[in-house]
Interface confidence: low
């Protein structure tokens, strides 16, 4: 805590400008205006304080809305924004995507901070659910963003926004979370014909069900090996291998190196040792 | 019941090398994220580096990035972490954890609902 002192004369700031960083933290305390601050925030970004000067503005800004920021502050917060803690961000009321890209892009490149946490979360419930914009925006800056809600969070992603996912973005996801997305999914690319349809579904199918592994087994699909691991083991137990021959296509050949590891491991297990020879791949029930 | 036992702890110079290892049982491996995480005397735990199922998405510290490295066998229930070059403040009790709680980072500590009991590693100047 900065102690109250009177501001030296001619000292006053009239401005936030570059000859604020020669202050010392208690002339910043007695010399700039809380008033003034909040409307020149978009200046600070632009002058090197120091991170005890910017814990003195940011004392300021608390001292002014101790409700919590007005979002014409907020969006200019820039490098101030690392001083938050999630407790300050809770009091905020963030509605503007744009605001939203102004604070992640200060963050950016590092692993999402409880602040950021925080602030998504606020964000996603002032909207009432993810809409396509918005996850557009969070997994352009966090791609592992989808796969760090909960099954219950997922559930409110609308499938229209599922068009705005990457396959990168669902690398980190779990069974659990796959499972809800999966049907999303379907549901988002249905009016989609056969191959572009698998190139859409193909990341999200750790979260299929076995009737909907054999419906794409007869569409000449051929199905990657790293596809088909991700697979639940549950989905691909019931397949027969001339399902799993169909769903792979050429790529079949790759169930020899990958026969010690599920879910392969697990298939070749519940076949017929008469129906695996006829891959010819010397694989043993 | 989940298991997870932490071994390849022990005493070295910095700049030397060790690999921790995890043993998983209990619980469907090849469908969980693993997480390694540290514990140094009278710090709080931390976590250190963390592995998705589909060994995609690998993320660590910003403290260790460049010097561990963690793998895992699902054939084997293994998970891994390769320490190089390492620095008297890596000193610590390390822990294997798993079943990542849906919401979270990947090295949020809690994050994790099942741990090891930890092995120690110890480097010395």
């Known amino acids: 805590e900065v102690e109250k002192t009177a501001c030296p004369s001619g000292k006053k700031a009239r401005e936030i400008d570059e000859s604020l960083i020669f202050y010392k933290k208690w002339e910043l305390e007695a010399c700039v205006d809380a008033a003034l601050l909040a409307t020149q925030m978009d200046r600070v970004n632009a002058i090197p304080f120091t991170y005890e000067q910017l814990d003195v503005l940011k004392h300021k800004l608390d001292e002014l809305y101790p409700q919590g920021y007005p979002e014409s502050v907020i969006q200019h917060l820039g490098y101030l924004f690392l001083k938050m803690s999630p407790e300050d961000i809770r009091k905020w009321n963030v509605t503007s995507l744009e605001t939203l890209k102004a604070l992640l892009e200060v963050n950016k490149g590092h692993e999402m901070s409880p602040q950021v946490a925080t602030l998504i979360d606020r964000f996603v419930k002032g909207r009432g659910q993810l809409d396509k914009d918005t996850l557009d925006t969070l997994t352009a800056f966090y791609p592992g963003y989808l796969c760090s809600l909960s099954p219950e969070e997922l559930s409110s992603v609308p499938p229209s926004s599922i068009w705005a996912v990457r396959p990168q973005d669902l690398d980190t996801c779990d069974p659990r979370q796959l499972d809800v997305l999966y049907p999303k999914a379907r549901l988002a690319f249905q009016n989609m014909n056969g191959s572009e349809y698998f190139v859409k579904i193909q990341s999200f199918l750790g979260g299929a069900p076995t009737e909907d592994l054999k419906a794409l087994s007869q569409q000449n699909v051929s199905m990657d090996l790293a596809t088909f691991m991700k697979l639940r083991t549950d989905a691909v137990l019931p397949l027969t291998v001339a399902e799993v021959q169909k769903l792979l296509g050429p790529h079949v050949e790759g169930l020899k190196a990958e026969e010690r590891h599920r879910p392969v491991r697990d298939w070749i297990l519940r076949q017929r040792q008469d129906d695996l020879d006829t891959l010819g791949l010397g694989l043993q029930g | 019941e989940v298991q997870l036992a932490e071994s390849g702890g022990g005493s070295v110079q910095a700049g030397g090398s060790l690999r921790l290892s995890c043993a998983a049982s209990g619980f469907t491996f090849s469908r969980n994220t693993m997480g390694w995480f540290r514990q140094a005397p009278g710090k709080e735990r931390e976590g250190v580096a963390a592995?998705?199922?589909?060994?995609?998405?690998?993320v660590y510290s910003d403290s260790v990035g460049g010097r561990f490295t963690i793998s895992r066998d699902n054939t084997k229930n293994m998970v891994y972490l390769q320490m190089n070059n390492l620095e008297p403040e890596d000193t610590a009790m390390y822990y294997c954890a798993t079943d990542r709680r849906p919401g979270t980072t990947m090295l949020a500590v809690n994050g994790y609902n099942h741990w090891g009991q930890g092995t120690q590693v110890t480097v010395s100047s």
């Open positions: 592995i998705p199922y589909t060994s995609t998405g690998i």
